[in-house]
C-alpha cells in the first residue's frame, strides 16, 4: 500500500465521510397497514430523507456495513382503552437479515398508556422513544413494529418517525 | 483541484473534523419565562457546552450546514392535574429559518402525564424525550417549546436539557 | 510539522476514525444486584459490543477523551405498586471520575409508572429513555442507576440497555 494507494484511500474516505449514512423517515397516512406488517414510512417529502441508506416496504436497508444508531418514536393516543385493544403496547425495532428466516428484536419497549386517562378526561396521549447502537451488514434491514398499531396517532410526520445514522 | 489543493482540503477537513459541531444545553431557573416563548437554557456552566454551534434566546444556531441529530428531554411533574393547566402536554423541537415567517415543527410529543397520579399519591412525574436527524442550514435555529411549561420541573440541569450534534 | 508528519497524522486519524469509540451493552439476568450498586450489563453476547471503550463492574470506561452521546433505556413493569416500593422511579446516568469522590449526575429522569395501572388491569409497563452529549476524559466511567431497581424488567437484552458513541 504505497503513497498513491494511501492517497486514494484518503480521498475516498473524505468522499464517503461526506455521505456518512443517515436517514429520517416520517409517519404518514399510509403508515398503518393493518396487515400485521411493519409500519410504512415517508422517505422524501417534508422532513424525510435517505442518505447512504435505502428503503423498501417499511424497512431501512443498509448499503454500507457498520455500527448505526437507530431510533424510532411513535405517538400513541386514544379515548379510554377500548375492549379488544391491547392495554400493553409493544414498540420495537427489528432486524431482517438474509442469514435468518425470522426478524430479530433489536430495541423494544412495552408501555401501558391507557392508565394515563384521568377521572376528568378519558383522552390520553403517550409517546414511546427507542434508540441504540447496533451493527448492521450490507443488505440487512431494520423495521418498526407497534402492537397494537391502532393506538398509533399519525398527523404530520413530526410525532412518529424512524431514523438511523452511522456512528 | 491539484494535489496541493486536495492536501489543503484534507488538512482543512481534519481541522473541521476536530470540531464536529455539538452542543448540550441544560435547564436552569431562568428556563421558564412564562412569556409564551421557547425555553431558555444554560450554555456554559456545569454540563452545558457549545462546540461549533451558537446560542441566542433559547435557540441553538447552526453555523455549519448539515444533518444534525437534535434531542431534548424535559422533566415533567406536579401534584394532581390542577384545573386550567393543560392535561395534555406538548413537547417539541421547532426550526426557525429566515425563509419562513413561522416556526416549523421538527419533532413533537404529546403526553398526558397527570394520569400517572395514583389513588395513594397525587404526586406524579413523567419525562419526555425527543431525538431525530434533521437537515439544518447555516443561520437556522432550533428551539424547544413545552405547553404547558408550568409542568416542567427544573433542578440541576440533568433532568431537562437540549442538544445536537452533526452526523 | 512537515508534510511527512501531516501525512502520518492523517493516516493515524483515518485509522482512529475506523474505530470511533462506541458501545452498546444489554440487560441480563445478572444486571440487578440488589446491592445498591449500579446496574450490570452484558458486554459480548447477542447485541452487546465494546469498540474503543472498556467495561468494569457496570461502568463504561472511557479510553479516549472527547464528547460522547451516552444513552440508556430501562423497561419498567409491575403489578400495582406494592407497599414499600417507591412510587417515583429515578433512572439516571452518572459519571465517576478520579477527581471527585462522589458520582456526578449526568442525565436523570423521574417517572411515576404505577399510575399506569388501570381499573381493569393492575399490570403496568413503562419505559424510560435517556440520551445526551457529555464530555468524558480518559479513565472516567459512566454507570446507570435505577431506584427502585426492583421495578426494572429484564428479558432478552432488547428492553433495557446502555450505550455510548463519540460524536
Amino acid at each position: 500500500d504505497g503513497p498513491a494507494g494511501s492517497w486514494e484511500q484518503l480521498i475516498q474516505e473524505r468522499r464517503s465521510h461526506e455521505v456518512n449514512p443517515a436517514a429520517h423517515l416520517t409517519g404518514a397516512n399510509s403508515s398503518l397497514t393493518g396487515s400485521g406488517g411493519p409500519l410504512l414510512w415517508e422517505t422524501q417529502l417534508g422532513l424525510a430523507f435517505l442518505r447512504g441508506l435505502s428503503y423498501h416496504d417499511g424497512a431501512l436497508v443498509v448499503t454500507k456495513a457498520g455500527y448505526y444508531y437507530i431510533y424510532s418514536k411513535v405517538q400513541l393516543g386514544g379515548v379510554g382503552c377500548p375492549l379488544g385493544l391491547a392495554s400493553t403496547i409493544t414498540h420495537g425495532l427489528y432486524k431482517r437479515t438474509p442469514r435468518y428466516p425470522e426478524e430479530l428484536e433489536l430495541l423494544v419497549s412495552q408501555q401501558s398508556p391507557c392508565g394515563r386517562a384521568t377521572s376528568s378526561s378519558r383522552v390520553w396521549w403517550d409517546s414511546s422513544f427507542l434508540g441504540g447502537v447496533v451493527h448492521l451488514e450490507a443488505g440487512e434491514e431494520v423495521v418498526v413494529r407497534v402492537l397494537d398499531e391502532r393506538l398509533v396517532r399519525l398527523r404530520d410526520g413530526t410525532r412518529s418517525y424512524f431514523g438511523a445514522f452511522m456512528v | 483541484d491539484g494535489p496541493a489543493g486536495s492536501w489543503e482540503q484534507l488538512i482543512q477537513e481534519r481541522r473541521s473534523h476536530e470540531v464536529n459541531p455539538a452542543a448540550h444545553l441544560t435547564g436552569a431557573n431562568s428556563s421558564l419565562t412564562g412569556s409564551g416563548g421557547p425555553l431558555l437554557w444554560e450554555t456554559q456552566l456545569g454540563l452545558a457546552f457549545l462546540r461549533g454551534l451558537s446560542y441566542h434566546d433559547g435557540a441553538l444556531v447552526v453555523t455549519k450546514a448539515g444533518y444534525y441529530y437534535i434531542y431534548s428531554k424535559v422533566q415533567l411533574g406536579g401534584v394532581g392535574c390542577p384545573l386550567g393547566l393543560a392535561s395534555t402536554i406538548t413537547h417539541g423541537l421547532y426550526k426557525r429559518t429566515p425563509r419562513y415567517p413561522e416556526e416549523l415543527e421538527l419533532l413533537v410529543s404529546q403526553q398526558s402525564p397527570c394520569g400517572r397520579a395514583t389513588s395513594s399519591s397525587r404526586v406524579w412525574w413523567d419525562s419526555s424525550f425527543l431525538g431525530g436527524v434533521v437537515h439544518l442550514e447555516a443561520g437556522e435555529e432550533v428551539v424547544v417549546r413545552v405547553l404547558d411549561e408550568r409542568l416542567v420541573r427544573l433542578r440541576d440541569g440533568t433532568r431537562s436539557y437540549f442538544g445536537a450534534f452533526m452526523v | 510539522d512537515g508534510p511527512a508528519g501531516s501525512w502520518e497524522q492523517l493516516i493515524q486519524e483515518r485509522r482512529s476514525h475506523e474505530v470511533n469509540p462506541a458501545a452498546h451493552l444489554t440487560g441480563a439476568n445478572s444486571s440487578l444486584t440488589g446491592s445498591g450498586g449500579p446496574l450490570l450489563w452484558e458486554t459480548q453476547l447477542g447485541l452487546a459490543f465494546l469498540r474503543g471503550l472498556s467495561y468494569h463492574d457496570g461502568a463504561l470506561v472511557v479510553t479516549k477523551a472527547g464528547y460522547y452521546y451516552i444513552y440508556s433505556k430501562v423497561q419498567l413493569g409491575g403489578v400495582g405498586c406494592p407497599l414499600g416500593l417507591a412510587s417515583t422511579i429515578t433512572h439516571g446516568l452518572y459519571k465517576r471520575t478520579p477527581r471527585y469522590p462522589e458520582e456526578l449526575e449526568l442525565l436523570v429522569s423521574q417517572q411515576s409508572p404505577c399510575g399506569r395501572a388501570t381499573s381493569s388491569s393492575r399490570v403496568w409497563w413503562d419505559s424510560s429513555f435517556l440520551g445526551g452529549v457529555v464530555h468524558l476524559e480518559a479513565g472516567e466511567e459512566v454507570v446507570v442507576r435505577v431506584l427502585d431497581e426492583r421495578l426494572v424488567r429484564l428479558r432478552d437484552g432488547t428492553r433495557s440497555y446502555f450505550g455510548a458513541f463519540m460524536v
Epitope: - | 401534584v79 394532581g80 384545573l83 386550567g84 397525587r122 409542568l151 433542578r155 | -
Partner: antibody
Framework: QVQLVQSGAEVKKPGASVKVSCKAS????????VHWVRQAPGQGLEWIGA????????SYNQKFKGRATLTADKSTSTAYMELSSLRSEDTAVYYC??????????????WGQGTLVTVSS | DIVMTQSPDSLAVSLGERATINCKAS??????????MNWYQQKPGQPPKLLIY???NLESGVPDRFSGSGSGTDFTLTISSLQAEDVAVYYC?????????FGQGTKVEIK
C-alpha cells in the same frame, strides 16, 4: 388592572337557591381559574370550588358537591356560583378570586369585593 | 382533607417590632423543592389580599417587610417591622390538594 366585580347582597329563604356573579376585567378571562371562597360572619375562609373558563371544567370541595354549581360565560367574562338548598349556616360573604399558578401550585392573587348572602326565614 | 393550624390565635406587637405567625399542616405540602403554601392578609370589611405564594415568594406590590419561610408541614410568616397598616387577620392556605384549606386565622394587633 385586574378587577373582579361581584353582584349585590342577597337575602334568601331556607331551601331556596342563590346565584352570585363575578365579572372579570383587565386580564384574559379564559386563561385563569375563578375560585369561590366563603366566610361566615366572624369565621375563617372556606374553599367552595373553582371553574376554568377556558373549557368550563370544574373542581369542587366535596362538602359542596351537588349543591354548588360553578359556571363561566366567556362572552361576558363572567363567572357564576349557584348554591341550592340553602340553610341558615350558608349565611356568609361569598368571594370570587382569580387563581394563578406557580408551577402547579395554585394561589388567589385577585379577589372580588364579596357578596353577602343571608339565609333567613 | 389537609388541616391547617395557625398559632397563635392572636398576637399583639409593638410598632417597629417583629411579628411571627406559625402555620402547621397535617401532612407535608412539599413537592420537588416547592411548598404549596400561601399567606393572605384580611382587613376588616375587605377581601383577603395575597402576600406570599409557594411559601416564600413575595407577591408583587407587597412590602418586603413581609416574608415567608418553612417547608414540609411547618411554615412561618414574618413581619420584620410592624406598621400600623399591618393590623389585620392573617391566613395560611395550602394548595397541595383539593379541597384547598385555610388556617383559622391569626389576628395581629398593636401593643
Amino acid at each position: 388592572q385586574v378587577q373582579l366585580v361581584q353582584s349585590g347582597a342577597e337575602v334568601k329563604k331556607p331551601g331556596a337557591s342563590v346565584k352570585v356573579s363575578c365579572k372579570a376585567s383587565g386580564y384574559t378571562f379564559t386563561s385563569y381559574n375563578v375560585h369561590w371562597v366563603r366566610q361566615a360572619p366572624g369565621q375563617g375562609l372556606e374553599w367552595i370550588g373553582a371553574v376554568y373558563p377556558g373549557n368550563g371544567d370544574t373542581s369542587y370541595n366535596q362538602k359542596f358537591k351537588g349543591r354548588a354549581t360553578l359556571t363561566a360565560d366567556k362572552s361576558t367574562s363572567t363567572a357564576y356560583m349557584e348554591l341550592s338548598s340553602l340553610r341558615s349556616e350558608d349565611t356568609a360573604v361569598y368571594y370570587c378570586a382569580r387563581g394563578s399558578y406557580y408551577y402547579t401550585s395554585s394561589y388567589f392573587d385577585h379577589w372580588g369585593q364579596g357578596t353577602l348572602v343571608t339565609v333567613s326565614s | 382533607d389537609i388541616v391547617m393550624t395557625q398559632s397563635p390565635d392572636s398576637l399583639a406587637v409593638s410598632l417597629g417590632e417583629r411579628a411571627t405567625i406559625n402555620c402547621k399542616a397535617s401532612q407535608s405540602v412539599d413537592f420537588d423543592g416547592d411548598s404549596y403554601m400561601n399567606w393572605y392578609q384580611q382587613k376588616p370589611g375587605q377581601p383577603p389580599k395575597l402576600l406570599i405564594y409557594t411559601a416564600s415568594n413575595l407577591e408583587s406590590g407587597v412590602p418586603d417587610r413581609f416574608s415567608g419561610s418553612g417547608s414540609g408541614t411547618d411554615f412561618t410568616l414574618t413581619i420584620s417591622s410592624l406598621q400600623a397598616e399591618d393590623v389585620a387577620v392573617y391566613y395560611c392556605q395550602q394548595s397541595y390538594e383539593d379541597p384547598f384549606t385555610f388556617g383559622q386565622g391569626t389576628k395581629v394587633e398593636i401593643k
